[in-house]
């Protein structure tokens, strides 16, 4: 008898009653497996359930496939042994007899697996599409809600204006929009959503309460509030919205009148610095991050804003890569690659009268309030708003001039009634936009302060001389820690030393201006500058401490600025005639530090504590300060430029070159210290009372150097 398969473990041997078992056993098992997929219907519920069911089915099929392949392998072996003349036992023979069946099953299982895999992919695609659709819908809803909040805050803000109140009471065509009681209700509600600073509460707690009120209003809840319900208040507010009162022409829109825009357009060409710096390497790498820039579109001259572009009214995130690239390709003077002490020395400037005239021209061109988002909306600590979901617009590539780094905010009184000792106010003071091209990766560590509004009347909270004090820059500390990562930098909240002011200005050397990040890229037209000595600066309106990685081998001499001449004016522009508004970048990132881009230290003006009724000019900018975690808190911090930061990338932050990436936005450390106040709009001049007792804090309460715990 041929040598049997007795030793080959694969076979099953049956000489006695050799079992036809192979088939019976294993086939049965296979059958059971095969049945499994049928019973595992893909769940029709949520995507997750479907995916899970599909996984299970695929798992069963996969297991079945493996079993069949294993079995087929055995059968092949049996057959081979049979061919060699070896005897198989009954189980093996039974198995071999099932060879065709196993082969067919295997093919079927493979086909089944392919089908289910395709189905699984389809399901995944569908789930992703659905999720994306849902996400978009959620974002849309969030956006709508945010828009509503902004509208609501705008309306509530506007109700501080007597003229608006009167108009709403009289109504359009004699039909009143709001009654006196309804106005009072809204006034009461305003106090809840725009509360006076309560020092017994942490800021985020206070705004948490405020946000709950806003939320309940948006929901139109039946809960009682201010002697009525949120639902009633919502109806009142909706009535105001529907009246379209604020859409009509008597409203002072943010931006320039047409003739002003037309007049300011030529200024663009003149804005390009005529200095001849060695251009740094252009940074042209396309940013992969969908970034968002904050641009006050209405603030641009018409020639600069390409009206042909689709206005992205409802799109909140806008790719600005092309813009960024086009801006980055402007020649930039390379700054010396050695970190220098933060001292700025004076630069001879043109005739004071000429300079003053220039500034006034500049201000005249930039009339009109900014219609920016309330800071309360930006207090992300207790809200689920995505920081990227804030009205954004790409900058127009044609705007490649550097923007002035100064703000000339008007003075706002604490109450709606004019204060006797206010500094004279130009009714239409202007703001020049600040450029923010900073990174979170590196945070310059100058001491940070909360500069108070220079002329704001704060009832005996602090002496006016201290308010107007210029805060000197602590150079030692800055230099020492400038190359430290944000987390390791000291947080400094110290009152600035009082120095005599030149022309009531705030010294641009002051730490808040140098180390705080500015908020918006507002592409405002800037008047032409003709003085050659002024234009010889690296960039006329460059970010202070223009930190750049330059590939330039030699150091470029930085023009020195006189400390006295670096003053940004508070209130109306009282700057001495020789002020230059220029902060030349001479603080460089040390070349060896390439772990994160330095925070561009830009002048920063705190214009938040504007009380209602003041001149509206200063609404545009939002302040920030450093909290205990050394994270910059305030105005939209969290912009991360997505650029290569190699030392020779030639990236200078003064040009609007960094696309903003919100991916790393740490919401939890972010708190706005100030909400912007809403001064009275446009050329209405003096603050208005609200009829009856003054509501001192309809704008924002003043808070100075308050550290949030």
């Amino acid at each position: 008898m041929p040598s049997a398969t007795s030793h080959s473990g694969s076979g099953s041997k049956s000489s006695g009653p050799p079992p036809p078992s192979g088939s019976s056993g294993s086939e049965a098992a296979a059958g059971a497996g095969a049945a499994a997929p049928a019973s595992q219907h893909p769940a029709t519920g949520t995507g997750a359930v479907q995916t899970e069911a599909m996984k299970q089915i695929l798992g069963v099929i996969d297991k079945k496939l493996r079993n069949l392949e294993k079995k087929k392998g055995k059968l092949d072996d049996y057959q081979e042994r049979m061919n060699k003349g070896e005897r198989l036992n009954q189980d093996q023979l039974d198995a071999v007899s099932k060879y065709q069946e196993v082969t067919n099953n295997l093919e079927f299982a493979k086909e089944l697996q392919r089908s289910f895999m395709a189905l699984s992919q389809d399901i995944q695609k569908t789930i992703k599409k659905t999720a994306r659709r849902e996400q978009l819908m959620r974002e849309e809803a969030e956006q709508k809600r945010l828009k509503t909040v902004l509208e609501l805050q705008y309306v509530l803000d506007k109700l501080g204006d007597d003229e608006v109140r009167t108009d709403l009471k009289q109504g359009l065509n004699g039909v009143p929009i709001l009654s006196e009681e309804e106005l009072s209700l809204l006034d009461e509600f305003y106090k809840l959503v725009d509360p006076e600073r309560d020092m017994s509460l942490r800021l985020n707690e206070q705004y948490e309460h405020a946000s709950i009120h806003l939320w309940d209003l948006l929901e139109g809840k039946e809960k009682p509030v201010c002697g009525t319900t949120y639902k009633v208040l919502k109806e009142i507010v909706e009535r105001v919205f529907q009246s379209n009162y604020f859409d009509s022409t008597h409203n002072h829109q943010n931006g320039l009148c047409e003739e002003e825009e037309a007049a300011s357009a030529p200024a663009v060409e003149d804005q390009v610095p005529e200095a001849e710096p060695e251009p740094a390497e252009e940074y042209t790498e396309q940013s992969e991050v969908e970034s968002t820039e904050y641009v006050n579109r209405q603030f641009m001259a018409e020639t600069q804003f390409t009206s042909g572009e689709k206005e992205q009214v409802d799109e909140w995130t806008v790719e600005t890569v092309e813009v960024v690239n086009s801006l980055q390709q402007q020649p930039q003077a390379a700054s010396p690659s050695v970190p220098e002490p933060h001292s700025l020395t004076p630069v001879a400037q043109a005739d004071p009268l000429v300079r003053r005239q220039r500034v006034q021209d500049l201000m005249a061109q930039m009339q009109g309030p900014y219609n920016f988002i309330q800071d309360s909306m930006l207090d992300f600590e207790n809200q689920t708003l995505d920081p990227a979901i804030v009205s954004a617009q790409p900058m127009n590539p044609t705007q490649n001039m550097d923007m002035p780094q100064l703000v000339c905010p008007p003075v706002h009184s604490e109450s709606r009634l004019a204060q006797p000792n206010q500094v004279p106010v130009q009714p239409e003071a202007t703001q020049v936009p600040l450029v923010s091209s900073t990174s979170e990766g590196y945070t310059a560590s100058q001491p940070l302060y909360q500069p108070s509004h220079a002329t704001e009347q704060r009832p005996q909270k602090e002496p006016i001389d201290q308010i107007q004090a210029t805060i000197s820059l602590n150079t030692d500390q800055t230099t020492a820690s400038s190359s430290l990562p944000a987390a390791s930098q000291p947080q400094v909240f110290q009152a600035g030393t009082s120095k005599p002011l030149h022309s009531s200005g705030i010294n641009v050397n002051a730490a808040p201006f140098q180390s705080m990040q500015t908020v918006f890229n507002m592409n405002a037209p800037v008047p032409p500058v003709n003085e050659p000595e002024t234009l010889k600066q690296q960039n006329q309106y460059q970010a202070s401490y223009n930190q750049s990685f330059s590939s330039q081998p030699h150091q470029v001499e930085q023009t020195e600025l006189q400390q006295e001449q670096l003053q940004t004016v508070v209130g109306t522009y009282h700057g001495s005639p020789d002020q230059s508004h220029q902060v030349t970048g001479n603080h460089q990132q040390p070349p060896q530090q390439n772990t994160g881009f330095p925070r561009s230290n830009q002048p920063y003006y705190n214009s938040r504590g504007v009380s209602r009724g003041g001149s509206r000019g200063a609404r545009g900018l939002m302040n920030g300060y450093r909290g205990p975690a050394n994270g910059f808190r305030g105005g939209y911090d969290g912009y991360r430029p997505s650029f290569s930061n190699t030392p020779n990338s030639g990236y200078t932050q003064s040009q609007f070159s960094a696309p903003r990436d919100y991916s790393g936005y740490q919401r939890d450390g972010y708190q706005q210290n100030f909400k912007r106040g809403s001064g009275q709009s446009g050329p209405r001049g003096a603050p208005r009372g609200r009829g009856g007792p003054p509501r001192p804090n309809r704008g924002m309460p003043q808070m100075n150097t308050q550290q949030v715990n």
Epitope: S3, A4, S6, S14, S15, P17, P18, S97
Partner: antibody
Framework: EVQLVESGGGLVQPGGSLRLSCAAS?????????MSWVRQAPGKGLEWIAY????????AYANWAKGRFTISKDNSKNTLYLQMNSLRAEDTAVYFC??????WGPGTLVTVSS | DIQMTQSPSSLSASVGDRVTIKCQAS??????LAWYQQKPGKAPKRLIY???NLDSGVPSRFSGSGSGTDFTFTISSLQPEDIATYYC??????????????FGGGTKVEIK
């Protein structure tokens, strides 16, 4: 229905002979099967006797069965046989035929007694 | 001939108990082993083939393991209908090295 039915059992005197048959239905003897005979004495365990491979007629026997017992098949009749000679009292048992070791007949009783 | 030794020859257990039966071959038979259940007056019924493969229709409380010379049969949770005698059998094809399809002596399982 696939089944096996044994026949030919009964009372036989010691030293006598008996031929057991196992009729297969539901399947053909032309397949690849081992057909076996197994017996079980009253109150005792199972005891394998012999098998034949239907395909080529190869046989194997338990040592104790060699010489006295012969396994055979008739493909045309689909029948398996067990020829028992020189029966002894200890051969008294129920005799089962089996296809492989999965399918069994109900058995037929063989009693060897004088 | 190959010899199969089964132990214990009988056992008594309670319903729900785990029951284990051993079978030892006189020489290595790889995994060529089957386990049978036989109830009085009936033909044996194969439960396990190739040492560990469960026949179709057999409850999963029955299982087999082992290879070479030592094999184990287990009833994970004894049920009243499991009262029977259990046998092991070498199922190798007879050859010069392994001869015969010998059965073990059987194990009678009873309920306490």
């Amino acid at each position: 229905e696939v089944q096996l039915v044994e026949s030919g059992g009964g009372l036989v005197q010691p030293g006598g002979s008996l031929r057991l048959s196992c009729a297969a239905s539901g399947f053909s003897f032309s397949g690849s099967y081992y057909m076996s005979w197994v017996r079980q004495a009253p109150g005792k365990g199972l005891e394998w006797i012999a098998y034949i491979y239907i395909g080529d007629g190869v046989t194997a026997y338990a040592n104790w069965a060699k010489g006295r017992f012969t396994i055979s098949k008739d493909n045309s009749k689909n029948t398996l046989y067990l020829q028992m000679n020189s029966l002894r009292a200890e051969d008294t048992a129920v005799y089962f035929c089996a296809r492989g070791n999965k399918l069994w007949g109900p058995g037929t009783l063989v009693t060897v007694s004088s | 001939d190959i010899q199969m030794t089964q132990s214990p020859s009988s056992l008594s257990a309670s319903v729900g108990d785990r029951v284990t039966i051993k079978c030892q071959a006189s020489q290595s038979i790889s995994s060529y082993l089957a386990w049978y259940q036989q109830k009085p007056g009936k033909a044996p019924k194969r439960l396990i083939y190739d040492a560990s493969n469960l026949d179709s229709g057999v409850p999963s409380r029955f299982s087999g393991s082992g290879s070479g010379t030592d094999f184990t049969f287990t009833i994970s949770s004894l049920q009243p209908e499991d009262i029977a005698t259990y046998y092991c059998q070498c199922t190798a094809v007879s050859s010069a090295t392994i001869y015969g399809n010998a059965f073990g002596g059987g194990t009678k399982v009873e309920i306490k």
